[in-house]
């Protein structure tokens, strides 16, 4: 018979034949042959593989480094990685939670809508038209543009969400 060019789900093609993939939590020791099944071995104590695979090495569980403010939220198994979270009152810097911050800052162009608490991180909002923020801050709201008119001045440069307006003297020349 013709050697296969594709294999079923949970199989892989090697040496013109379809071998079974190793199940999650196990790594490949040796490919199948015409006479033997794929040989797999369970991952070690601090290792995992989370898919049907032909990996020869298991992945190391993530280390939740206490020096970065991390602690274990969920211990890893042979089929799942460890999930880290931050110490109480601290917040993850990303979905993967690789490090912790006390709170995040709102970038220029954004103001603080709600200051961080022990439970929730800083909530930022874009500065609307007429307001700006030129700093990175965890407490400052968007500031209103300066009103040139109230100072008997005129707008020389328009404001943006990151910059205030620039006021200047009125043109004294009259037609």
């Amino acid at each position: 018979p013709e050697p296969p060019t594709a294999c079923r789900e949970k199989q892989y093609l090697i040496n013109s034949q379809c071998c079974s993939l190793c199940q999650p939590g196990q790594k490949l020791v040796s490919d199948c042959t015409e006479f033997t099944e794929t040989e797999c071995l369970p991952c070690g104590e601090s290792e995992f593989l989370d898919t049907w695979n032909r990996e020869t090495h298991c992945h190391q569980h993530k280390y939740c480094d206490p020096n970065l403010g991390l602690r274990v939220q969920q211990k890893g198994t042979s089929e799942t990685d460890t999930i880290c979270t931050c110490e109480e009152g601290w917040h993850c810097t990303s979905e993967a939670c690789e490090s912790c911050v006390l709170h995040r800052s709102c970038s220029p162009g954004f103001g603080v809508k709600q200051i961080a608490t022990g439970v929730s991180d800083t909530i930022c909002e874009p500065c609307p038209v007429g307001f700006f923020s030129n700093v990175s801050s965890a407490f400052e709201k968007c500031h209103p543009w300066t009103s040139c008119e109230t100072k008997d001045l005129v707008v020389q440069q328009a404001g943006t969400n990151k910059t205030d307006v620039v006021c200047g003297p009125q043109d004294r020349l009259r037609a």
């Epitope: 020096n67 970065l68 601290w90 006390l102 801050s137």
Partner: nanobody, 116 residues
């Protein structure tokens, strides 16, 4: 490596005053927003006060408004918290924190105990 060292804590009677200091070494406070944060025994972190990088804007938690004053001296690379009219509920370890607020920009804290 940035190190923040808080000092000035101690035992004080209700109604008394203390001035906390936070000195930065290995880096600078200049131009950075800085916070005072406290942790009372058995409680979570509470954000007490903050000062902008320019020193022009400040924030105070409602619980300390009118009693605490935050200030900075960038020439001395030091942050201050003047605490007046102290109450028993101000008892806590006080920490300073500098932008970017990562765990390694975090001091050991100074203990303030308000008790008669």
């Amino acid at each position: 490596e940035v190190q923040l060292l808080e000092s000035g804590g101690g035992l004080v009677q209700p109604g008394g005053s203390l001035r906390l200091s936070c000195a930065a070494s290995g880096s600078t406070f200049a131009g950075y927003e800085v916070w005072w944060v406290r942790q009372a025994p058995g409680k979570g972190l509470e954000r007490v006060s903050a000062i902008s990088g320019s020193g022009g804007s400040t924030y105070y938690a409602d619980s300390v408004k009118g009693r605490f004053t935050i200030s900075r001296d960038d020439s001395k690379n030091t942050l201050y918290l003047q605490m007046n009219s102290l109450r028993a509920e101000d008892t806590a370890v006080y920490y300073c924190a500098r932008d970017p607020y990562s765990f390694d920009y975090w001091g050991q804290g100074t203990l303030v105990t308000v008790s008669s």
